[in-house]
């Protein structure tokens, strides 16, 4: 996988009036490392490693850059003509990547009310617009506004990409020490479901990198895919990942089952806790890990946030 730096910005308007401030989040190699504090108007570290490794100067620079980008995005939103009453959002996702062969990529994507209407390649300045007439209209609005802005030259886009790559390289260098292999913590839990069947769940957490094998075995043999349920491998906010796998077994047969984990050349098997005492009668088996948005505003205003 290439190394990547991604910024996610959003501005809102209510009844045609663009709200002050903006929402922002930064991801390094898919891991959250930055969040923008709207109250304090500052970029802040997200996750322990970002706090430990990236110095104060980083957050000053990020605050300046994000403030400028946020103002840009607010100005762009004011030029979107079709704003009816109610709440609207304009979101920009900016990504730069360094691939294994040292080649680079850069792009930005714009969403209006959660719908993609414009993608730009920052290296070639080529734009892509979805087929829908709404997307075409929105893209035209925005590009026309940019043409009027003397700042939005090819040099500006190239600088944007160069700046992003420079940061990415700097962050990767800072992060080398912490981006070592972190083995998962594995834990197995049981919950009684019905008629003598138990759901056993195996959770792996706090591991890095994200590639992992997690599977249930019966008598040492992997269960078929259709008898297991897997969770997504998700960032846990600390520069590491988490995931889970669950299956249903007959009560009394716990001893036959183990959770097998393989990660970065290491492996391990983890038995099911046996005995009635360890079967948690009322434990919820809600395996859905919801990605909580940047800010309570997303919950409150039901804005769709594109990852």
């Amino acid at each position: 996988e290439p190394h990547s730096l991604r910024y996610n910005l959003m501005v809102l308007s209510q009844d045609g009036s663009v709200q002050s401030g903006f929402l922002a989040e930064g991801h390094l190699d898919g891991q959250p490392f930055l969040r923008y504090d709207r109250q304090k108007r500052r970029a802040k570290p997200q996750g322990q490693w970002a706090e430990d490794v990236l110095g104060a100067k980083t957050w000053d620079t990020e605050t300046e850059d994000l403030t400028e980008n946020g103002q840009d995005l607010r100005r762009t939103l004011t030029h979107i003509k079709d704003q009816k009453g109610g709440l609207h959002s304009l979101q920009e996702i900016r990504v730069c990547e360094i691939h294994e062969d040292s080649s680079t990529r850069g792009s930005r994507h714009f969403y209006y009310d959660g719908e993609l209407f414009l993608s730009q390649n920052l290296e070639t300045q080529e734009s892509t617009v979805p087929q829908s007439s709404r997307a075409q209209t929105l893209a035209m609005n925005v590009t026309n506004f940019w043409k009027e802005d003397a700042m939005k030259t090819k040099t500006h886009y190239r600088a944007m990409q160069a700046d992003c790559l420079q940061k990415l390289q700097r962050y990767l260098k800072s992060g080398v020490a912490i981006r070592r292999t972190v083995p998962p913590m594995v834990n197995v839990t049981c919950s009684e479901v019905s008629e003598g069947n138990i759901t056993v769940t195996c959770r792996a957490s706090s591991f890095y990198p994200r590639n992992i094998t997690l599977t249930w075995r019966q008598d040492g043999v992997s269960l078929s895919h259709n008898t297991q349920q897997w969770g997504d491998v998700l960032p846990d906010g600390n520069g590491t990942y988490q995931t889970w796998v669950a299956t249903r077994i007959r009560q009394g047969e716990e001893q036959r089952f183990t959770c097998y984990m393989e990660h970065s050349g290491n492996h391990g098997t983890h038995p099911v806790p046996s005995g009635k005492a360890l079967v948690l009668q009322s434990q919820r088996t809600d395996h859905h890990h919801h990605h909580h948005g940047l800010n309570d505003i997303f919950e409150a205003q039901k804005i769709e946030w594109h990852e």
């Epitope: 075995r217 008598d219 040492g220 043999v221 992997s222 047969e253 492996h267 391990g268 098997t269 038995p271």
Partner: antibody, heavy 118, light 107 residues
Framework: QVQLQQSGPELVKPGASVKVSCKAS????????IYWVKQSHGKSLEWIGY????????VYNQKFKGKATLTVDKSSSTAYMHLNSLTSEDSAVYYC???????????WGQGTLVTVSA | DIQMTQTTSSLSASLGDRVTITCSAG??????LNWYQQKPDGTVKLLIF???SLQSGVPSRFSGSGSGADYSLTISNLEPEDIATYYC?????????FGAGTKLELK
């Protein structure tokens, strides 16, 4: 390739005990269970139990509990089966086997003949 | 314990024959059934797992089928190296149990 090399034949006296070994090679020993199977002369196969070399966890056939004890030595990738209080009923060929993680008893050792005789 | 019954203890067949060996379980075993081949020198080999999946490296003349409590192993075109004893084994419930075996001989 996966190989399970078992120890040689044993002639033991009634009441004594014996330890059969099974040395694994060609794969990561702690990844897969080791299973033990008994075959009395001219008879069928009987599953004794299995051990998880990663953590030493064992599961036994109730019939062999107290008769067989399964252990492993991770440093030498070797599994052991200790049989105690031997009687003529324990005279048999004992096999160890392992899995590829997708099917039981995928690979078998060549067998160890244990003869219990006064 | 789940009893595995191989009613035919020995079977004579000629080279090139299609041979079917049957096995029945004392109760339904949800296709959790394997077939093994034991050569006269004692060497044991897995042929079929989970009723019908052919183990890697096993010739395609071997096939397995069945459901519920009744299962079978078929050798479509008997070869000299197939002369052996064949065992079925269930892994639906502990203890894991084997059939008594079917010894295949040449006519």
């Amino acid at each position: 390739q996966v190989q399970l090399q078992q120890s040689g034949p044993e002639l033991v006296k009634p009441g004594a005990s014996v330890k059969v070994s099974c040395k694994a090679s060609g794969y990561a020993f702690t990844k897969y269970n080791i299973y033990w199977v008994k075959q009395s002369h001219g008879k069928s196969l009987e599953w004794i139990g299995y051990i998880d070399p990663y953590n030493g966890g064992t599961v036994y056939n109730q019939k062999f509990k107290g008769k067989a004890t399964l252990t492993v030595d991770k440093s030498s990738s070797t599994a052991y089966m200790h049989l105690n209080s031997l009687t003529s009923e324990d005279s048999a060929v004992y096999y160890c086997a392992t899995t590829d993680g997708y099917s039981l008893f995928t690979y078998w050792g060549q067998g160890t003949l244990v003869t219990v005789s006064a | 314990d789940i009893q595995m019954t191989q009613t035919t203890s020995s079977l004579s067949a000629s080279l090139g024959d299609r041979v079917t060996i049957t096995c029945s379980a004392g109760q339904g075993i949800n296709n959790y059934l394997n077939w093994y081949q034991q050569k006269p020198d004692g060497t044991v080999k897995l042929l079929i797992f989970y009723t019908s999946s052919l183990q890697s490296g096993v010739p395609s003349r071997f096939s397995g089928s069945g459901s519920g409590a009744d299962y079978s192993l078929t050798i479509s075109n008997l070869e000299p190296e197939d002369i052996a004893t064949y065992y079925c084994q269930q892994y639906s419930k502990l203890p894991l149990t084997f059939g008594a075996g079917t010894k295949l001989e040449l006519k």
